[in-house]
């Protein structure tokens, strides 16, 4: 049994757009103790949409659902979604270190933006 | 019903160990993340070891780091802290605790007692 | 570390009236928009017991009359309206990625 899944129930979403998209992901636990992070893409060339503690991202809210019991919410929210936007996203594990490890990676939710 | 039955508690000389042990059962104990805290009168309730549902991953406070070793057997449905070195200030009521989600503490057992006296 | 707060150490109130506790952390336990704090109430001779989780999340088989709130640093645990089997001291727990995880001093609620 594995100790921590990383879960991005959508393969895709497609969003208007201006609108925001709202990208999804759940983990089966906090521990390891280390932070949960979003990109855009894979490899060396991946681009940080989002960190929990560090950084200024002004587009990006999370949105997480406390209630959820049975496990723990990294979802967040996009808003003015442009073309340029559209990708595959990526919500990814670290265990804490000097520096973080990568732990794991959910299986990427694909944005895709529709004309106005 | 979910139980969490602590044993291995008593008194031991400053210096001595002792193997604590906490016996689950109503739960999927390998699903869990498990944790030990403890109570005493004069500073409350103190964290003292959590591990991983599956035992990669064990964190201490620095109180008791390098003395005291959590581990656990899934197979058993069974939590084990092995103290060392133990201090005066290791006096206390040790509760075996369960979390879902490595978040907050679920459950709770009675807790066993551990004197450290010379 | 993240210290915890809980005021006031104790608090007499009348049956049927609100009790209303405290706990300040000196740093912010949010993450994601969640709140990492959490609170028990332990009577004499027994283990805590999880009322709420995550602020405000009131645990399965708790009563309603229990209720949590706050953000960031500052979280309220309210008992409305106050029962005797409420007589009970109360803890609140952070449970950040900040370790080590940490208990406020806690809080005996009596009756008036």
């Known amino acids: 049994e594995e100790e921590l899944q990383v879960i991005q129930p959508e393969k895709s979403v497609s969003v208007a757009a201006g609108e925001s998209a709202t990208l999804n992901c759940t983990a089966t636990s906090l521990i390891p103790v280390g932070p949960i992070q979003w990109f855009r893409g894979v490899g060396p060339g991946r681009e940080l949409i989002y960190h929990q503690k560090e950084g200024h991202f002004p587009r990006v809210t999370p949105v997480s659902d406390p209630t959820k019991r049975n496990n723990m919410d990294f979802s967040i929210r996009i808003s003015n979604i442009t073309p340029a936007d559209a990708g595959t996203y990526y919500c990814v594990k670290f265990r804490k270190g000097s520096p973080d490890v990568e732990l794991k990676s959910g299986a990427g939710t694909e944005l895709s933006v529709r004309a106005k | 019903e979910v139980q969490l039955v602590e044993s291995g508690g008593g008194l031991v000389k400053p210096g001595g160990s002792l193997r604590l042990s906490c016996a689950a059962s109503g739960f999927t104990f390998s699903s869990y993340v498990m944790s030990w805290v403890r109570q005493t009168p004069g500073k409350g309730l103190e964290w003292v070891a959590t591990i991983s549902s599956g035992g990669t991953y064990t964190y201490y406070p620095d109180s008791v780091k390098g003395r005291f070793t959590l581990s656990r057997d899934n197979a058993k449905n069974s939590l084990y802290l092995q103290m060392n070195s133990l201090r005066a200030e290791d006096t206390a009521v040790y509760y075996c605790a369960s979390q879902l989600t490595g978040s907050e503490f679920d459950y709770w057992g009675q807790g066993t007692t551990v004197t450290v006296s010379s | 570390d993240i210290v915890l707060t809980q005021s006031p150490a104790s608090l007499a109130v009348s049956l049927g009236e609100r009790a209303t506790i405290s706990c300040r952390a000196s740093?912010?336990?949010?993450?994601?928009?969640?709140?990492?704090m959490h609170w028990y109430q332990q009577k004499p001779g027994q283990p805590p017991k999880l009322l709420i989780y995550r602020a405000s999340n009131l645990e399965s088989g708790v009563p309603d009359r229990f209720s949590g709130s706050g953000s960031r640093t500052d979280f309220t645990l309210t008992i409305n309206p106050l029962q005797a089997e409420d007589v009970a001291t109360y803890y609140c727990?952070?449970?950040?990625?900040?370790?080590?995880?940490?208990f406020g001093g806690g809080t005996k609620v009596e009756i008036k």
């Open positions: 727990h952070q449970s950040s990625d900040e370790l080590p995880w940490t």
């Open positions: 740093e912010s336990v949010d993450l994601y928009g969640t709140s990492f």
